[in-house]
């Protein structure tokens, strides 16, 4: 807290300027009047004020709006949203793009804080789904957002919004966010034509089930091998040995390289030898010729 | 963290010159505006000048004219104060400052390099 003392003669501020880093402590609580401080918020980020002073500014501005700050404030924070709490942004309602980029901006290019977290969870609740120019702002600034998001919260997310989502915002999702992901991305293209479609599709592909990649094998798709390996073990296992050839094209020879990997392994322990040996990759590990395979899944289901 | 050694300080006629050197280390990417105050036996510590993030310099009004604060963003941050005209008055333990961006942000401090002005 800072004692309060008279301003000295001649020091109380007419504006906001340079001159105030000059100030010590108890002369920005003394001379620095907060509603002036209010108006020209749009000056404090232009100037080199400590910490300590800026703890003083916000200080300031607390006592003027105990209930939380006014969006016309908080645009203009700048430098001082490096000292806000969650506990304080929880106070606000900040509803306009330019004010949540506005703050953003402050913290570019760092981690995303706990204060900044709070700031988007306020933004996203304010305005009741992710559209598609949040999400633009949002992974713009954080490439890693949507995938921090958990599949209960990427579930609001309209399919309209999938426009926005570049290939590297989807690199840390797990498959339960893509599970969500996709069925929207699926809506979101349905539209386009087979290799325009395949382009768009690819990155959530580690959310489609079997059908679908049975499908995408039916359309010379030339899958690459990292996409391969980011599928869904459970709709690999079932395709068939044509139709893992026909989705891989000309890639189809990288299997070699991923035999021990998943899901090509479960997969090529799924697959008769036989088939595996028209490949011509030696891939080895397939049922045997003339053992049968029970569906033990499907056994359990009749009984 | 951030480590900041000061040099430069010594005895020096009234009118002569001096130029203060401040060589900071650790997490320099992170350093957002650098200052330098001085302390005068007896007295609290004032602020003499303060290059922010984007260069820009600003000065105590007594050594306006006189001072200039200037930095090196090279790899290793160097902060520096040429002092010309000086005075007896100028004479104090001159400490080099700097902060970090993010949540809260932190203040770091070198030990002072002492200047005295003197016939």
């Known amino acids: 807290e800072v004692e309060k003392t008279a301003c000295p003669s001649g020091k109380k501020a007419r504006e906001i300027d340079e001159s105030l880093i000059f100030y010590k402590k108890w002369e920005l609580e003394a001379c620095v009047d907060a509603a002036l401080l209010a108006t020209q918020m749009d000056r404090v980020n232009a100037i080199p004020f400590t910490y300590e002073q800026l703890d003083v500014l916000k200080h300031k501005l607390d006592e003027l709006y105990p209930q939380g700050y006014p969006e016309s404030v908080i645009q203009h924070l700048g430098y001082l949203f490096l000292k806000m709490s969650p506990e304080d942004i929880r106070k606000w309602n900040v509803t306009s793009l330019e004010t949540l980029k506005a703050l953003l901006e402050v913290n570019k290019g760092h981690e995303m804080s706990p204060q900044v977290a709070t700031l988007i969870d306020r933004f996203v609740k304010g305005r009741g789904q992710l559209d598609k120019d949040t999400l633009d702002t949002l992974t713009a600034f954080y490439p890693g957002y949507l995938c921090s998001l958990s599949p209960e919260e990427l579930s609001s997310v309209p399919p309209s919004s999938i426009w926005a989502v570049r290939p590297q915002d989807l690199d840390t999702c797990d498959p339960r966010q893509l599970d969500v992901l996709y069925p929207k991305a699926r809506l979101a293209f349905q539209n386009m034509n087979g290799s325009e479609y395949f382009v768009k599709i690819q990155s959530f592909l580690g959310g489609a089930p079997t059908e679908d990649l049975k499908a995408l094998s039916q359309q010379n798709v030339s899958m690459d091998l990292a996409t391969f390996m980011k599928l869904r073990t459970d709709a690999v296992l079932p395709l068939t040995v044509a139709e893992v050839q026909k989705l891989l094209g000309p890639h189809v020879e990288g299997l070699k390289a991923e035999e021990r990997h998943r899901p090509v392994r479960d997969w090529i322990l799924r697959q008769r030898q036989d088939d595996l040996d028209t490949l011509g990759l030696g891939l080895q590990g397939g049922i045997p010729n003339g053992y049968l395979v029970l569906d033990l899944s499907m056994q359990e289901a009749l009984s | 963290q951030v480590q900041l050694v000061e040099s430069g300080g010594g005895l020096v006629q009234p009118g002569g010159s001096l130029r203060l050197s401040c060589a900071a280390s650790?997490?320099?990417?992170?350093?957002?505006?650098m200052r330098w105050y001085r302390q005068a036996p007896g007295k609290g510590l004032e602020l003499v000048a303060t290059?922010?993030?984007?260069?820009?310099?600003?000065y105590l009004g007594s050594v306006k004219g006189r001072f200039t604060i200037s930095r090196t963003n090279a790899k290793n941050t160097l902060l520096y104060l040429q002092m010309n005209s000086l005075k007896p008055e100028d004479s104090a333990l001159y400490i080099c400052?700097?902060?970090?961006?993010?949540?809260?942000?932190?203040?770091?401090w070198g030990q002072g390099t002492q200047v005295t002005v003197s016939s």
């Open positions: 290059v922010s993030n984007d260069g820009s310099a600003y």
């Open positions: 650790g997490s320099i990417s992170s350093i957002r505006h």
């Open positions: 400052n700097a902060d970090t961006w993010g949540w809260p942000g932190a203040d770091y």
